[in-house]
Amino acid sequence: MGKGDPKKPRGKMSSYAFFVQTCREEHKKKHPDASVNFSEFSKKCSERWKTMSAKEKGKFEDMAKADKARYEREMKTYIPPKGETKKKFKDPNAPKRPPSAFFLFCSEYRPKIKGEHPGLSIGDVAKKLGEMWNNTAADDKQPYEKKAAKLKEKYEKDIAAYRAKGKPDAAKKGVVKAEKSKKKKEEEEDEEDEEDEEEEEDEEDEDEEEDDDDE
C-alpha cells in the first residue's frame, strides 16, 4: 500500500525495534569507527532482550505505544494517491482460499520461531519455516497434506454454493473499496507471512530420497 508515497506515515515500531535502535546508538557511541556485523549484532540484541526483566522492557513498550498512537493519528488524515487503493471489492462472505500443507505447517511453528527469535524479520521467519519444511520427510508431511486436501475439498463445495447463490451487487459492479477495513495487527502480519511463505513454497524442493510410509 503506497510504498513509494513520501507522504505516507512511517510504519509503527515495536518495543523490540526501539530496543534494537537504542542498542545500535549505544554501539555507535562506544565504537564510532567500527563496522557492524549485523548477524552477530542482532544475535546479541536478541539474547539481551530475552534476559531483560518486564520492568526494563517497560520503557521500550511505552515508546512503542506512543509510536502506535502517532501512527494511528497520522493514518487518519492520510489520503493515499489515486490508483493506490487496495484491490477490488472483496466480499467478506466469500469462502476463504484454503491453506496449503506448507501454510498449515507454518501456522503451527511460526509462534515458536517468533518467540525464540524476537528479532527475526518476517522474511527470515519464512526462510526458517521453509528450511524446517524441507527437513521434514515426505511421509511426515502427509498429515498436513491430508488436512490441506480436506480443507480444499470443503472450499470447493463452499465456493460452488457461493457462486450458485450469486455474488453481491457491489462485487458485480466492481466497486473499489478505498479504505482498508481495520484489521487486527496479527491478521496483517499473517497476511504478509502468508505471501512470504507462498514464495518459499514455490522455491522449496522436496527431499528426493524420502519414501511414503503413512503414520
Epitope: E108, T136, A137, D140, K147, D213, E215
Partner: antibody
Framework: EVQLLESGGGLVQPGGSLRLSCAAS???????DMWWVRQAPGKGLEWVS?????????AYADSVKGRFTISRDNSKNTLYLQMNSLRAEDTATYYC????????????WGQGTLVTVSS | DIQMTQSPGTLSLSPGERATLSCRAT???????LAWYQQKPGQAPRLLIY???SRATGIPDRFSGSGSGTDFTLTISRLEPEDFAVYYC?????????FGQGTRLEIK
Amino acid sequence: EVQLLESGGGLVQPGGSLRLSCAASGFTFSWYDMWWVRQAPGKGLEWVSWIVPSGGITAYADSVKGRFTISRDNSKNTLYLQMNSLRAEDTATYYCARGNYGPSPFDYWGQGTLVTVSS
Amino acid sequence: DIQMTQSPGTLSLSPGERATLSCRATQSVRKNFLAWYQQKPGQAPRLLIYDASSRATGIPDRFSGSGSGTDFTLTISRLEPEDFAVYYCQQYGNSPIIFGQGTRLEIK
C-alpha cells in the same frame, strides 16, 4: 524448569476406557509438538500418538488407531489421551514427551503413569 | 518401516572402563536423525544424544555419539557408577518413529 506430569492411569477391564492427562509447566506449551510413548512391563519403548501445537493435526501408531484419541488444551497447558476399547496388550507405562516439530528426539519426558488392562 | 537393532543385548563392564553400544538400522536413517536415551529403573528415559552426534543439554562429555547411514555408536569414555542403565537408540528421520530394543549396561 520444564516439567511434565502424567495422571489418570490405573486398573481397567478389557473393553474399558481411561483418560490420561499430562500437565506441562516451565515452557511455552503451545509452541511444541507433544507425544505419548508407552513401555510394556520389562519391554522397550513404542510411540503411541503425536499432536501438533494447535491440536489440529494428529497421528497414531497402527496398534491404537481408531481406539485412542490425543488432544490438548493450550489454555490449561495439558495434553490428553482418551483410550477406549482397551486390550490386555495396552498394559504399559504411558509417558508424555515433548518434541520439536514432526518426528524428533524427545527432550523432556514425564515420569509416566501405569495403565493395567486386566479382568 | 525401518527396524533398529541394538547390540549387545547386555554389556557387563566395570566403572572406569569404556563402553561401546551399537545401533543398526535396516535402511539408511534420513539425515542421520538418530537419538540415544538412557533409562534407569523406575524412571523415564533421558535424552543423551540427538542428530547422531550432538549432546543434549546437561549431558556430560564422556557420552559421545557417532556413525551415519545405517550404523551408529554410543560411546561412554569412562564409566561412572550412575551410568549403569538401559540405553535405547531411536530413529526420527521417517515415520513411524522407531526405538531399538535397548542395551542393558550392567556392573561386572
